[in-house]
Amino acid sequence: FGISGKHFITVTTFTSAGNIGEDGTLSCTFEPDIKLNGIVIQWLKEGIKGLVHEFKEGKDDLSQQHEMFRGRTAVFADQVVVGNASLRLKNVQLTDAGTYTCYIRTSKGKGNANLEYKTGAFSMPEINVDYNASSESLRCEAPRWFPQPTVAWASQVDQGANFSEVSNTSFELNSENVTMKVVSVLYNVTINNTYSCMIENDIAKATGDIKVTDSEVKRRSQLQLLNS
């Protein structure tokens, strides 16, 4: 949070996570000012000379932008007057992780706030029944994770059971040599039960559920960013 008081305005940021290779947003809001031409937004990154992005006098000024951010950043220009200084970041890289500062100056005053940006890879798991196995098994796959996550299985019927002895998890490096595909197989499953495959690293936690009955298979998956 920025410092409130005379000549200072409140600036608020939120810790967030970026998914490598996807587009991300660094969130920052401030006390609105209807005088767009008097608003200056500067995004800085700790350890980087030059700016990540600058918006002033109602338009971008990228003359001081660091090379690593060239062609990758934009503010939501039409939302600046309502106090949105968030930064759109294209093609998130592992090296984009770090501490960013959102600095704001308006006719009301100035303020700044820091933001911790974590980068990694996370994706939804998909669980399928593996009919090829000698005994009925479940196969949980998630295409992109980094850093290497932990994988755990749970079941509604056998709550608290440890499935590590009856499951096998593998990690396959993807073509860009950073992220990995996660595959986990759970053996000896029983019908009329709901199984969950949980994948987690320090950035995200994803869960895939599957309910197998005689007549149907129901699936559900969800993904939650941690510490965001």
Epitope: E22, L62, K90
Partner: antibody, heavy 120, light 107 residues
């Protein structure tokens, strides 16, 4: 509205340097949210991005052409320029200048293009 | 660099019919993709950016969709002025690259 116009010699000899200038009218080259780019199209073929320049003079070139490309800008004349050295017949193309979004990085509008033939 | 592949190379369509053009990226480009129209002797014209955002002034019959590696440009009902070559362009990472183009011709 914003218009771009390429100018320069239509014929260049092999091993020499191709030089083109793009004049921007109807708007300022100092537009903060835009780069200024060059794209080329060999006869009957597809499009190749050559590189871009910001009004402050910072540049980014296509690695495949980087060793031969130089771009510059003259804000007082509202112009930016392309130089391509050591040309061969493979550099024969229609050369376009265009305004490039800083992000999203679309090209719009484009100049009408100028054909440069490399031949002795 | 990211290689963009367009298919088909040529598409023969009757006026009033729907045209579906495909563009595939060699790796994910998220939604960082633009579509252009080029007529003979003219410069390309921007139609779509961010995979699906139509440029102001471009008719609603043009629509873009897709994300990741698979993209589509759809022209819902072809007009005579729509017969041209269409290019996709990725701006996900440098160097920006274009597809080889799809020529939409009168059937």
């Amino acid at each position: 509205q914003l218009q771009l116009q390429e100018s320069g010699p239509g014929l260049v000899k092999p091993s020499e340097t191709l030089s083109l200038t793009c004049t921007v009218s109807g708007g300022s080259i100092k537009s903060g949210s835009h780069y200024w780019g060059w794209i080329r199209q060999p006869p009957g073929k597809g499009l190749e991005w050559i590189g871009n320049i910001y009004y402050s003079g910072s540049t980014y070139y296509n690695p495949s052409l980087k060793s031969r490309v130089t771009m510059s800008v003259d804000t007082s004349k509202n112009q930016f320029s392309l130089k391509l050295s050591s040309v061969t017949a493979a550099d024969t193309a229609v050369y376009y200048c265009a305004r490039e979004g800083s992000y999203p990085n679309w090209f719009d509008p484009w100049g009408q293009g100028t054909l440069v033939t490399v031949s002795s | 660099e990211i290689v963009m592949t367009q298919s088909p190379a040529t598409l023969s369509v009757s006026p009033g019919e729907r045209a579906t053009l495909s563009c595939r990226a060699s790796q994910s480009v998220s939604t960082n993709l633009a579509w252009y129209q080029q007529k003979p002797g003219q410069a390309p014209r921007l139609l779509i950016y961010d995979a699906s955002a139509r440029v102001t002034g471009i008719p609603a019959r043009f629509s873009g969709s897709g994300s990741g590696t698979e993209f589509t440009l759809t022209i819902s009902s072809l007009q005579s002025e729509d017969f041209a070559v269409y290019y996709c362009q990725q701006y996900h990472s440098f160097p920006f690259t274009f597809g080889g183009g799809t020529k939409v011709e009168i059937k």
